[in-house]
């Protein structure tokens, strides 16, 4: 066993010299990105006061591609590097094309009108005009690939001028924009070359420590790893930590029970029922707040201050009013929970899928005349699955080093 | 489907005032917001100002200010545009718009109403 | 602000062109509404966001904009289609909608 231990130390830090370098520095594991998005069923309804109502539609599939870059490695035992991410659509495995058309809230009127609630009325009256003018209306027809990737929107040219320097968005605005083709930020990790504990662990993001989204030194924490690999030799007790740049927030996953993946021994770890719970039912959220039910996240202060709200697909696990308030939501623990499956020994994963959803706060807001009279709920946009599994040689190899070969060396 | 009926034609002396009326019908007043516009013969649409009847709020197009005021009566389902210290040049058609709602640019215009400035 | 040339004209079952020039702070920046405007009547709303047909407009409509002009184009032209064209779009430095002067269409 020390040798096996010795071994596995030496080939899972970050390292050249290292048997998962590689894997760590390119991916091996095929990644699929799958979104399913919410058609809105009754728009007119809606803008008269009445109940929302959807209809799931998707899955449509991508095939994720993820290399690092700008590896450096700093003398402190860190390693810093910018990982990229491309995405290809696969209509084989895909339930229709990028070409669909989807009804969906108007995220820049409808947030823009929420975010302006409080604003003088003038302000409102001339945004009333201006949506007028442009042809925005609080619904939208779009193609999937116009709400993925960007479509050309004279609001956004607008929101530009009288919001200046709040908008990451230049003429095109989509709800996957920023992640095609770009990175998620500079992380700096630690290699476990000298220290093989902190393996993984976040040194700084972007230069950060700590965030300042949020209203709590413990909910600004920049905790666990960057969520592809773990520190080795977990327990049942272990947690499993990372720091995801897309919510904007440190995220910990609790280990719910053992299992095997193709012939490898592995930890399930899944999402806690207070990872989105709000800071009345579990108090070291209150820095996520302002909250409404629990079970959603409010993700405004990173994305743009428009009403954004993170979730499990279907408000699974929230307030029951959440999901009581659109027609058409059906969670389910079996289609909508999110895991992770990790070889325990090597912190590495071997099969997880990672759910959330997209929802925007909506409402009527006085002298914005786009809204109607939208009654107050949080209207699902999309939920998306992350998903990768192990397989081929990658499997093989991994198989042979870290259970066959144990195994007869045991012996 | 909403309709917008405006009063009929006005003549007016320079320096008088004048107000013209838009009434709604076929659907609820306080769902639409009112536009007004004035047309000079031979020209395009001028925005003047806009009205949410629901709580009588206003702005006007600089070029009016402080000589144009929008008024709503949700008792009667009517929104007023008054034009003070009229001039010469405010001979026009004036036309109260709509956009109905979920629609875009103004879909819906009252029939014009002539305003004659002439002494 | 948005010119128009003021007179077209066209032969019935022609290809009219509508141009409405602008500048950066409106039609360089946001999308553009067509107008129609019959003899006598009030405006009525032809095409919004730069392409778009209203509803009831026949597909012999079609818009268009490259840069800080636009253009509104019929084809098939047809005798009821003689009206005045306005162009429209939001301008930025003057927080409102701008109209252009006009074209009137004479189908020959």
């Known amino acids: 066993p020390s040798l096996i231990k010795q071994q596995v130390l030496k080939n899972v830090r970050i390292d050249p010299s290292s048997l998962s370098f590689n894997m760590w520095k390119e991916i091996p594991i095929p990644f699929y990105l799958s979104v399913y998005f919410f058609d809105v069923m009754n728009p007119s309804e809606i803008l008269k006061g009445e109940k929302p109502q959807v209809r799931e539609r998707g899955p449509y599939v991508y095939r994720e591609f993820r290399h690092k870059s700008n590896i450096t490695f700093n003398n402190n035992d860190t390693v810093s590097f910018l990982e990229y991410r491309t995405f290809q659509f696969q209509p084989s495995k895909s339930h229709g094309s990028e070409s669909d058309y989807i009804v969906m809230p108007n995220i820049l009127v409808l947030g823009a009108a929420v975010m302006m609630e409080n604003k003088p009325m003038t302000l409102k009256l001339i945004m009333t005009l201006a949506f007028t003018t442009l042809g925005e209306r609080a619904f939208m027809n779009r193609t999937v690939g116009e709400i993925m990737w960007g479509y050309k929107d004279p609001l956004v040219n607008l929101i530009n001028k009288y919001f200046p320097g709040m908008f990451p968005f230049k003429d095109k605005f989509g709800l996957f924009a920023e992640l095609n083709n770009s990175d998620s930020g500079l992380f700096t990790v630690f290699t476990g070359v000298q220290n093989i504990s902190r393996i993984h662990l976040v040194d700084k993001w972007n230069g950060l420590s700590k965030v300042d989204f949020w209203h709590s030194d413990q909910c600004n924490m920049i905790n666990g790893t960057s969520g592809q690999m773990w520190p080795p030799f977990m327990t049942p007790e272990s947690s499993l930590e990372f720091y995801s740049p897309e919510a904007c927030r440190s995220m910990k996953l609790m280990y719910k029970e053992s299992g095997v993946f193709e012939g490898i021994p592995t930890y399930r770890f899944v999402a806690p029922k207070t990872l989105f719970a709000n800071g009345s039912i579990y108090p070291p959220n209150e820095g996520f707040c302002p909250c409404l039910e629990s079970g959603i996240q409010n993700v405004s202060t990173c994305r743009f201050s428009a009403p954004l709200f993170l979730s499990h697909p279907h408000f699974l696990n929230a307030d029951p009013v959440l999901a009581e308030a659109v027609t058409g939501l059906h969670p389910n623990q079996e289609a909508h929970s999110l895991f992770l499956d990790i070889h325990p020994v090597t912190g590495i994963p071997m099969n997880c899928s990672v759910k959330l959803q997209l929802s925007l706060y909506m409402k009527s807001v006085a002298g914005i005349g786009q809204t109607g009279k939208i009654e107050p709920v949080v209207l699902p946009l999309l939920w998306f699955a992350e998903s990768g599994a192990m397989e081929g040689e990658t499997l093989h190899t991994f198989y042979t080093q870290l259970v066959l070969m144990p195994k007869v060396m045991h012996y | 489907e909403v309709q917008l009926v405006q009063s009929g034609a006005e003549v007016r002396k320079p320096g008088t005032a004048v107000k013209i009326s838009c009434k709604v019908a076929?659907?609820?007043?306080?769902?639409?917001?009112i536009y007004w516009l004035q047309q000079a013969p031979g020209k395009g649409p001028e925005w003047m100002g806009l009205?949410?009847?629901?709580?009588?709020?206003?702005i006007y197009a600089e070029k009016f200010q402080g000589r144009v005021a929008i008024t709503a009566d949700t008792s009667t389902d009517t929104a007023y545009m008054e034009l003070s210290s009229l001039k010469s040049e405010d001979t026009a058609v004036y036309y109260c718009?709509?956009?109905?709602?979920?629609?875009?640019?103004?879909?819906?215009w009252g029939q014009g109403t002539l305003v004659t400035v002439s002494s | 602000v948005l010119t128009q040339p003021p007179s077209a004209s066209g032969a019935p079952g022609q290809r009219v062109t509508f141009s409405c020039s602008g500048s950066?702070?409106?039609?360089?920046?946001?999308?553009v509404n067509w107008y129609q405007q019959l003899p006598g009547a009030a405006p009525r709303l032809l095409m919004h966001?730069?392409?778009q047909r209203a509803s009831g407009v026949p597909d012999r409509f079609s818009g268009s904009k490259s840069g800080t002009s636009a253009s509104l184009a019929i084809t098939g032209l047809q005798s009821e289609d003689e009206a005045d064209y306005f162009c429209?779009?939001?301008?930025?430095?003057?927080?409102?909608?701008?109209f252009g002067g006009g074209t009137k269409l004479t189908v020959l």
């Open positions: 009205i949410d009847p629901k709580d009588a709020q206003t």
């Open positions: 718009a709509t956009d109905s709602v979920g629609s875009a640019g103004f879909d819906v």
């Open positions: 966001t730069t392409d």
């Open positions: 950066g702070s409106n039609i360089g920046s946001y999308t």
């Open positions: 076929g659907d609820t007043f306080t769902d639409y917001f």
């Open positions: 429209a779009a939001w301008d930025d430095s003057l927080d409102g909608p701008v």
